[in-house]
Structure formats: C-alpha cells, structure tokens
C-alpha cells in the first residue's frame, strides 16, 4: 500500500499527496488553543483506472459499471490524528486526540 | 456518522449508497469458488460543501483552498469484509476474510 508524494513544483498529474499547512487563526477558528497551525496535507490528481486503487471493490464497481458510478477519485486512504487543546461549547478547555486530521497517503477509491 | 441509502428509483442527487450485486462468473473471475455473487454496493452522487463530510480535514482543505484541490467526492467511508473461498496463484484453495469488499456507508471526503 503506497501513495505518491508531490509538492508545488511537481508536474505529476496522477493522484498525489501535497503539503498543506492549516492555520486556524487565519480561518478565525479562535476556539482552537493549540496547535494554531499544523501540517494537514491534501490529495489531488487524476485517477487513471487501477492506479493507486486502495480496494478490490473499486475495481469490481468499475467492471460492473452501474448507472451513475463516476469512477474512482483521489482521496485520503490513510489518515492520522493530532492532539488538540480547544474550547468546547460549554466554555470548558478540552484536550483530545482528534482523528483524521492529517493525510498520510492518497489513493483512488 | 451517517450516510444516505438510495436505489435505482431514487431522485437523490447527493452522495448516496446504491445497491450493486457483483457477479464474479459474469466477470469471468473463475478463480473465485464462493461466493459466486455478493452485494457490494457503490457510492454515487454530488458532494455539496459540508454535506456528509466524514473528516474535519475535508472542511479545512476547502477553507484553505490550495492549488488543485478538487473538493470532496462521494466515496466509501465505511466498508466491511466478506469471507471468500478462492484459488491463489499456486493452485491452492484458500479460505479467507477479504477486507473492504462491501460498502456500508458513503460520504464526502
């Protein structure tokens, strides 16, 4: 199970993981205490048939070709959490592991 | 965490799970001993912003709007395995749990 890594200088057109730093302050998300910024990454690119397909299911749907199935798209296939300190809706400070905040790998599904 | 379920008569345009029976015999996949057919389901539909987004990450990437990010697409967000009996490449009969063969839920990611 692997995925491509790219950067802003890459000429890769296929599904790839790109770097992206999310800045909560710039978004006005002032309920986030820490971190104020983190490396989130994102997925972008084309999904030629079979390239980086995560599941056999994707291949099967392509073969069955049902009405409205749009073919696979470039999407996170492995994500990881980050530890965050934030205010909840009751003015309490909460520390927690927030799942699926970082894209570790991209693929076609 | 929920997702929409549709069928061939639905008028729903948003991201939805549709029924799909995969027939291995029809595909010519003769190395599959059993099951010969199974209910795989598939995802199809539009991902309006925020609708059925599985991860906060999806929302953050939309806000950051980096070069080449295409917006979320309708993709499996929960999958389950099936038990299969099949021939491997060494002519051995294998019984095993094959992951991610059935779409249980669709969402935008």
């Amino acid at each position: 199970d692997f995925g491509l890594d790219c950067d802003e200088h890459s000429t890769e057109s296929r599904c790839c993981r790109y770097p992206l730093t999310v800045d909560f302050e710039a978004f006005g998300w002032d309920w986030i205490i820490a971190p104020k910024r983190y490396k989130a990454n994102y997925c972008s690119g084309e999904c030629e048939f079979v390239f980086l397909q995560k599941y056999p299911h994707t291949h099967l749907v392509h073969q069955a070709n049902p009405r409205g199935s749009a073919g696979p798209c470039c999407t996170p296939t492995k994500m990881s959490p980050i530890n965050m300190l934030y205010f909840n809706g009751k003015e309490q400070i909460i520390y927690g592991k927030i799942p699926a905040m970082v894209v570790d790998r991209c693929g076609c599904s | 965490d929920f997702g929409l379920d549709c069928d061939e008569h639905s008028t729903e345009s948003r991201c939805c799970r549709y029924p799909l029976t995969v027939d291995f015999e029809a595909f010519g996949w003769d190395w599959i001993i059993a099951p010969k057919r199974y209910k795989a389901n598939y995802c199809s539909g539009e991902c309006e912003f925020v609708f059925l987004q599985k991860y906060p990450h999806t929302h953050l990437v939309h806000q950051a709007n980096p070069r080449g990010s295409a917006g979320p697409c309708c993709t499996p967000t929960k999958m389950s395995p099936i038990n299969m009996l099949y021939f491997n490449g060494k002519e051995q009969i294998i019984y095993g749990k094959i992951p991610a063969m059935v779409v249980d839920r669709c969402g935008c990611s």
Partner: antibody, heavy 113, light 108 residues
Framework: EVQLLESGGGLVQPGGSLRLSCAAS????????MSWVRQAPGKGLEWVSA????????YYSDTVKGRFTISRDNSKNTLYLQMNSLRAEDTAVYYC??????WGQGTLVTVSS | EIVLTQSPGTLSLSPGERATLSCRAS???????LHWYQQKPGQAPRLLIY???NLAAGIPDRFSGSGSGTDFTLTISRLEPEDFAVYYC?????????FGGGTKVEIK
Amino acid sequence: EVQLLESGGGLVQPGGSLRLSCAASGLTFSRYGMSWVRQAPGKGLEWVSAINSSGGSTYYSDTVKGRFTISRDNSKNTLYLQMNSLRAEDTAVYYCARLPDYWGQGTLVTVSS
Amino acid sequence: EIVLTQSPGTLSLSPGERATLSCRASQSVSSSYLHWYQQKPGQAPRLLIYSTSNLAAGIPDRFSGSGSGTDFTLTISRLEPEDFAVYYCQHYSGYHFTFGGGTKVEIK
C-alpha cells in the same frame, strides 16, 4: 489577528482605587472566559481573577477577594478589573488573557505614597 | 488548592548545553491541563508546550515536555541564545489557574 490591549494602569496611593480595561479584537470575545494575571517587578506570574463568557460567574484568588471586581461588556468586547483598597503588594504589571493562549502586553499598576 | 513548585529557581548554562526544568505539583494533576510558558524580559508569556508534551505552533523541536501525576519536566536538548528566558509551568482546573514560581535559564 487576536489583540488584547490593556489600559488604565498608573500610580495610585495605598487605599486608593483604579479601574483597568482590556479591549479585545480578532476574537469572538463573548464566547470565552477571560482572566487577569499579574506579575510583580522581578517576580513570577500570579493568576488574579477570571470571569465566564456571560459575566454571570466570577472567580478570584484569595489575595484579592473582596477588594477586586472583574466584569465585562460583551457589546464593547471589553474586560474590566475594578481594584479597590489597593496595597503596595498589588504593584505589578497586569495582563488581560484568554488563558492559556492569548495575552495582552500588560499595564503597570504602581501603589505607592 | 494545588501548588506548583519549580526547580531550580535559576539554571546557569552555556549555549549548546541541555537544560532540564522541573515542575512538581502538591497533588496529582491532569497531564492534559499542565502547560509550560516562556517569558522574555518586557514581553508577555507565550505558550510553549501544551498538555504536558505537545509543542505549540512555531516552537522548535529542541523543546520537549514529559511527566504525569505530580512530576513534570521541560527539557531543552541544546540551548540556543534565544532560549535564555524564564519558564513557567501552569495548571488549569475549572476557572482556577495556578502558576509555578518560574525557572530562570541564564547564560553561564
């Protein structure tokens, strides 16, 4: 950008009063509890008082209880600290803060005859 | 009431050396709400490490935090000139905030 700007500090005689203000910008002020923290010259940080988002609940350290009053005006995005019966040991830089992350630059209060 | 005791009061070290700062609580505290600040002369404190061991944004990875229960540690693996400052631990419980007395890291 979040900014907390304190004002109202100065020289006051023992037994006197002073009112500090903290103007908040870049922050959804009405959603958060706010605090005052002080630092005597050459000393460490001391939490003084806190108030919840609506202003309905207030909290004080034992050293200032009964003498200081914290309040807020959410329509003006402003936090206040009314300080009465001031003592020499109240001399400090007073910081307005949304603990633990946002702090003002502080205003100096000197209590001396 | 929880009391946080920091030691040593002053740490005299040279650039490049390792600094180990201690923060001891009078009773067991939640590691989720034990934070460290750095303060330089004439400046407001800034959040350095949150929830015992997580680096705040923009903080270099030569800083690290650890601990649980009553004993917490801030470590600077290799001191840089800009690291000479005062460091405070802080605990949060409800609307009550407690600060340690601080450790001054000075140039030897």
